[in-house]
Amino acid sequence: AFGISGVQKYTRALHDSSITGISPITEYLASLSTYNDQSITFALEDESYEIYVEDLKKDEKKDKVLLSYYESQHPSNESGDGVDGKMLMVTLSPTKDFWLHANNKEHSVELHKCEKPLPDQAFFVLHNMHSNCVSFECKTDPGVFIGVKDNHLALIKVDSSENLCTENILFKLSET
């Protein structure tokens, strides 16, 4: 977890939010855990943040992430619909001015200090899976999801809709 007080003091005024010219429809703080109930934690190491997937000790506080939700249209020619389909997109920020960021070249998930407007790599399409789990698909690389690999977050290519429910790309959100 953060050695600094950043996350636990993160009941600050929500991000001022004119990201890509649109405002989030809602924002809230939640802890992020895997399908198998391991916690996603963030640590400051050598002046950069590392992301870990780990079991927390009994009374250890979970790190919180600010989730900002945006509506996005995908054009009817992409969705195959007669109408534009609305998708729910999310950005994830564990501490002020830092956002989860998809590095598609390295297949990695990183924390980057970003200026607004945020780059597309900071946006993920939210999918509800497995009733109360979610997954995060890269806006910049459809079919690629945030997943768990070797106790770290990584980008994982999902080849078919049957594999959308594989446990390593499923996450749980909790306000507690």
Partner: antibody, heavy 122, light 107 residues
């Protein structure tokens, strides 16, 4: 324009079966989560079953689990609800409803069909 | 499952009145709450999603607020076409659950 049209309702005896259909136009059903919601005469809305746009499910309310089966035929852009072992308490108008968001149920249901009445009585 | 409790179950009001309907969730649902209007013999129609976002085509006389467990639907100036039953629905956790409904009647 999005349209959902249910059919297949009617009068059936207790223990009988019906298959409801929901034909969609203006959208590709497979891109969206879809649900069946029912409303007994003079009562409120009750969720019955769902299939997620992301491929999860189907999921069922406890009251219909083991008796109802939800499916969709992507080639026909049609949703189905096979209802077996029907009971008097299943009497209701059955609506199909579309998730507002492709892939997520967080936005509620933005399009509903007009409904089809199922009456279970001897 | 999350229980949704709506109040009042019915309200009598006159054209031009301000009407407020509340919805309480049995546990926190962040902001994922929807409001629907239903007229007799018709299907429900979505009014508000994400607690406060107005669905396209819905008049701005309707507004929603709240987060966590307590939510409100307000009709700022009741019009004749607004006499109907209103339902809240939580969309945060599966399965989706609805409030019992609030019937807005003519005084």
């Amino acid at each position: 324009e999005v349209q959902l049209v249910e059919s297949g309702g009617g009068l059936v005896q207790p223990g009988g079966s019906l298959r409801l259909s929901c034909a969609a136009s203006g959208i590709t059903l497979s891109s969206y989560g879809m649900s069946w919601v029912r409303q007994a005469p003079g009562k409120g809305l009750e969720w019955v079953a769902s299939i997620f746009g992301s491929g999860g499910g189907p999921y069922y309310a406890d009251s219909v689990k083991g008796r109802f089966t939800m499916s969709r035929d992507n080639s026909k852009n049609t949703l189905y609800l096979q209802m077996n072992s029907l009971r008097a308490e299943d009497t209701a108008v059955y609506y199909c409803a579309k998730d507002r968001y492709s892939g997520s149920y967080y936005g509620g249901f933005d399009y509903w069909g007009r409904g089809t009445l199922v009456t279970v009585s001897s | 499952d999350i229980q949704m409790t709506q109040s009042p179950s019915s309200v009598s009001a006159s054209v031009g009145d301000r009407v407020t309907i509340t919805c309480r969730a049995s546990q926190g649902i962040t902001s994922w709450l929807a409001w629907y209007q239903q007229k007799p013999g018709k299907a429900p129609t979505l009014l508000i999603y994400a607690a406060s976002s107005l669905q396209t085509g819905v008049p701005s006389r309707f507004s929603g607020s709240g987060s966590g467990t307590d939510f409100t639907l307000t009709i700022s100036s009741l019009q004749p076409e607004h006499f109907a039953t209103y339902y809240c629905q939580q969309a945060n956790s599966f399965p989706p659950t609805f409030g019992g409904g609030t019937k807005v009647e003519i005084k």
